[in-house]
């Protein structure tokens, strides 16, 4: 939930020329959605992993990383059909022979159960129900993140009316 | 109109070769996998090949390997199969589909065109 | 290659009659099955999709339902035109993408 505004204290119509310091608000861009302490943005195009992630890299985002079974659910609590899939953020490391999130840790084994194979080449997407592997080159929609971000609007009281 | 319209279909001879084309209207074409999907009379539904949305995944059935290709041309929102060295088994009414989008290579085909015969017969 | 098995393989009912068809596949496919109709000399239509989930547009007298290896059409109160034929299919995310030997609703 983001953080309601407290009433203003400043007279207004004794300060109308005056600028004045709005409260420090946590805001997702807009078309972005607030889940907890994230902004996700979810793709209405389709992309092989690779590209879904350069994409977030130029919205300065990442793909999406999950941190625990409850954010698992909460994201796919946002998806409305159980057939449509979002890459995230996790493939399989060859090199390491495991799967490796892209901020660099690996899967925990309790962390999420992935279906699928775990070799070469395989990323890894969320559907509404589950978390599974598929080709990398494998064209689907993804879920960009990014953390919230403090804004500090300096704003006219003109414009509060 | 959302709509997928076959043609190029017709009567060939044995070891002769064909090109069907499937053109797509009334969605983003670009956006969704495509598949051939054939029909020989009075028998079962058999899925021949797919492309992904870009163009650079393929797949074919084993009965049509080496034989058919499929491409298709995203700004012309047209899909194509290649049949070359037919058979008298590939007689069938051929079907373009669209999959639903963006459930990856899980294939459940939401939108079908009528179909084009192709008959193969000496 | 995964194997789907439908039966019956034909079935008479009538007009608001429960009729059930069933899936079976050769190893488990999970909830990766679709279910279409198809009318003499039309393409076939999606009814369900994902074992249970119903395709916009389709009456809700259809559902869907079963995972790994079952699965169940349901036509829970049958109208005057859905007597075609139905298959199933699997789609599983490697080829081929099967289909059963499907079902024909008859007219009883």
């Known amino acids: 939930q983001k953080p309601s505004i407290g009433k203003c204290s400043v007279d207004i119509q004794q300060n109308r020329t005056k600028t004045t310091e709005r409260p420090d608000l946590l805001n997702c861009p807009i078309y972005w959605q607030q889940v907890q302490e994230k902004c996700l943005l979810f793709s209405h195009t389709v992309n092989p992993w690779n590209n879904s992630l350069a994409d977030c890299s130029t919205k300065e985002s990442s793909l999406l990383l999950i941190q625990d079974k409850d954010e698992l659910t909460r994201t796919q609590n946002l998806i409305h059909d159980k057939a449509i899939s979002f890459w995230i953020g996790l493939n399989f490391s060859l090199s390491e022979k495991n799967w490796k999130w892209i901020n660099g840790s690996f899967l925990s084994s309790n962390d999420l159960k992935i279906t699928g194979d775990a070799k070469e080449n395989s990323c890894v997407y969320i559907s509404q129900t589950s978390v599974y592997s598929e080709y990398c080159s494998t064209e689907m929609k993804w879920i960009c993140q990014k953390e919230l971000t403090l804004v500090r609007n300096k704003v006219s009281p003109d414009s509060w009316l | 109109q959302v709509q997928l319209v076959e043609s190029g279909g017709g009567l060939v001879k044995p070891g002769g070769s064909l090109r069907l084309s499937c053109a797509a209207s009334?969605?983003?074409?670009?956006?969704?996998?495509m598949s051939w999907i054939r029909q020989a009379p009075g028998k079962g539904l058999e899925w021949v090949s797919y492309?992904?949305?870009?163009?650079?995944?393929?797949a074919y059935a084993d009965s049509v390997k080496g034989r058919f290709t499929i491409s298709r041309d995203n700004a012309k929102n047209s899909l194509y199969l290649q049949m070359n060295s037919l058979r008298a088994e590939d007689t069938a009414v051929y079907y373009c589909?669209?999959?639903?989008?963006?459930?990856?290579?899980?294939?459940?085909?939401?939108?079908w065109g009528r179909g084009t015969l192709v008959t193969v017969s000496s | 290659d995964i194997q789907l098995t439908q039966s019956p393989s034909s079935v008479s009912a009538s007009v608001g009659d429960r009729v059930t068809i069933t899936c079976r596949a050769s190893?488990?496919?999970?909830?990766?099955l679709a279910w279409y109709q198809q009318k003499p000399g039309k393409a076939p239509k999606l009814l369900i999709y994902?074992?249970?989930s119903l395709q916009s547009g389709v009456p809700s007298r259809f559902s869907g339902s079963g995972s790994g290896t079952d699965f169940t059409l349901t036509i829970s109160s049958l109208q005057p035109e859905d007597f075609a034929t139905y298959y199933c299919?699997?789609?599983?995310?490697?080829?081929?993408?099967?289909f059963g030997g499907g079902t024909k609703v008859e007219i009883k």
């Open positions: 589909a669209r999959s639903l989008m963006a459930t990856g290579t899980h294939l459940y085909f939401d939108l």
């Open positions: 009334g969605f983003t074409f670009s956006q969704y996998y």
């Open positions: 492309i992904s949305p870009s163009g650079a995944t393929i």
């Open positions: 190893q488990g496919i999970s909830s990766w």
């Open positions: 994902a074992a249970e």
């Open positions: 299919q699997q789609v599983t995310s490697q080829p081929p993408y099967t």
